[in-house]
Amino acid sequence: FKVATPYSLYVCPEGQNVTLTCRLLGPVDKGHDVTFYKTWYRSSRGEVQTCSERRPIRNLTFQDLHLHHGGHQAANTSHDLAQRHGLESASDHHGNFSITMRNLTLLDSGLYCCLVVEIRHHHSEHRVHGAMELQVQTGKDAPSNCVVYPSSSQDSENITAA
């Protein structure tokens, strides 16, 4: 399986909410002995590998923001901790999973990574990740709403987020 990032760049005004999204692609084993561990973190475009370093999002670690379930089951973080920081991660039945960040500030700008670990019990782990950039802007040049830019594999025309 692979992870796709529908949008590689999100440009948002300060104070706005944004939902960053990743999507699981390819065959997904729904066997009872396969589990998916999904999480989010901030990172940097490292020399060795993008998304290798795992930094907190608003002081919450990837351990705090994880989702865990089998196959394409839906799940979301119910952590009061995450919600107190204006964060919520969620996953649906179609392989989409996301993190919503509320009331954006300039400090939220940076590289964000989604990580999916396919746990094949009695065998091994398989990990894949996706990366996207968030730019939070302020002042007269800032957009009125978030503007999202599709990843290069998709249509290059920018789409305004609802």
């Epitope: 589990t35 561990y37 290798s52 994880h66 089998g70 670990v117 019990h121 009695h122 782990e125 990990r127």
Partner: antibody
Framework: QVQLQESGPGLVKPSETLSLTCTVS????????WSWIRQPPGKGLEWIGH???????NYNPSLKSRVTISVDTSKSQFSLKLSSVTAADTAVYYC???????????WGQGTMVIVSS | EIVLTQSPATLSLSPGERATLSCRAS??????LAWYQQKPGQAPRLLIY???NRATGIPARFSGSGSGTDFTLTISSLEPEDFAVYYC?????????FGGGTKVEIK
Amino acid sequence: QVQLQESGPGLVKPSETLSLTCTVSGGSISSYYWSWIRQPPGKGLEWIGHIYYSGSTNYNPSLKSRVTISVDTSKSQFSLKLSSVTAADTAVYYCARDIPAFAFDIWGQGTMVIVSS
Amino acid sequence: EIVLTQSPATLSLSPGERATLSCRASQSVSYYLAWYQQKPGQAPRLLIYDAFNRATGIPARFSGSGSGTDFTLTISSLEPEDFAVYYCQQRINWPLTFGGGTKVEIK
């Protein structure tokens, strides 16, 4: 802050079963792997096995025939049973949280188990 | 199973010196390798994950490098509290395995 605490007998007779429990406090046991690792006196670390919160287990092949790891999410505990012990099983036994695609990030302080008659 | 071989077994150095510890895997573990520090009477503590990333709260004098089968943990300038035993550990597949350890002792 998540903390782990091992408990169980410090002395076990040869051929008997070693039983240890690890209590998880300050966080949920309903995610991650929960591992047992041991360290014989003056030697290195050996991974015994782990259990996922869902109940799936993986064991070190060298111990598999004698090991059982179980979890009780209602009590936030997971347990180790090692049967037919010998003096070679004398070690400090650690429980640890094992994050998928990461590492053992939180450890108990360890409990010494001596196998002797 | 994957065998991790650490060298040297013992490293005798003085505070302020640079320590270089090696970990070699019997087959490729990609970059899925962690390093731990253990002091007498204590549980191990995570230092480095995924070969080169420092865990939370670990000082910048600790750095990891390598991929595939050869890995290095470097302590740029030894502090008194760094004298301990260091273990590498792979997680590319199960069973999870540790190296035999390198003891860094005061010269």
